[in-house]
Amino acid sequence: AFGISGVQKYTRALHDSSITGISPITEYLASLSTYNDQSITFALEDESYEIYVEDLKKDEKKDKVLLSYYESQHPSNESGDGVDGKMLMVTLSPTKDFWLHANNKEHSVELHKCEKPLPDQAFFVLHNMHSNCVSFECKTDPGVFIGVKDNHLALIKVDSSENLCTENILFKLSET
């Protein structure tokens, strides 16, 4: 569990209501790990942040990210539940003023310092593929997900619904 103080420091408003509303409906801090329990860590190197996928030592502290949940203002196109619920998008921020971004040209996931309103590249549609796992689909490139490739985060194209459970796009969120 975590205290509100850490979350309050990061509370931000998003002013582009056409994307996902004025402000997040919920925010909380969590650590991010892969399906195989490797940790996603963030390190400041040469004035920019690098993202690593690595095994932590036994008592090493996990990095936390602020997950901010936004309701889409547009009804989902999917068949099934339709307007019964608004699709949720998330932004992920490991430190103040930095957000995970999808670089679709380079098929990479990067940390960018940016002004509000946040660009579309910072938003990811949240999926539950597997019991306690989530996946993050690029708002800017449907069918492309954050995944793990060569011990780094990358953008991975998922061609069919059968591949939605592929382990390299599954992540675990933990508050401990």
Epitope: A1, I25, Y69, K86, V134, T176
Partner: nanobody, 121 residues
């Protein structure tokens, strides 16, 4: 479809306590979090408390130390124990859940109809 049904609201004197409940039902595959928001007359809806599937909690500063959120995963139910209630806690309290259903992996936000809490002497 996912339905959220709140209960437990009512009239209480300042300093008193209430316990709100919210039960989720329907074709729920997974629940990412369940939480409570409130909306006082003429004000914007605000987050009160949230509990995640992993057990993490987050509270608004104004209720920290007075309100406690908890969950019962087996019943897909979330509770809000409200103690030391104040007049400024008067509002409609809404349950909110982030969940995916068996018809889609996409996580969606679902809301209850709200339950009125009035704190007055």
């Amino acid at each position: 479809q996912v339905q959220l049904v709140e209960s437990g609201g009512g009239l209480v004197q300042p300093g008193g306590s209430l316990r709100l409940s919210c039960a989720a039902s329907g074709s729920i595959r997974t629940v990412n979090y369940m939480g409570w928001h409130r909306q006082a007359p003429g004000k914007q809806r605000e987050l009160v408390a949230v509990v995640t599937s992993g057990g993490g909690t987050n509270y608004a500063d104004s209720v920290k130390g007075r309100f406690t959120i908890s969950r019962d995963d087996s019943k897909n139910t979330v509770y809000l124990q409200m103690n030391s209630l104040r007049a400024e806690d008067t509002a409609v309290y809404y349950c909110n859940a982030a969940a995916s259903t068996y018809s889609s992996t996409v996580v969606r936000s679902f809301w209850g109809q709200g339950t009125l809490v009035t704190v007055s002497s």
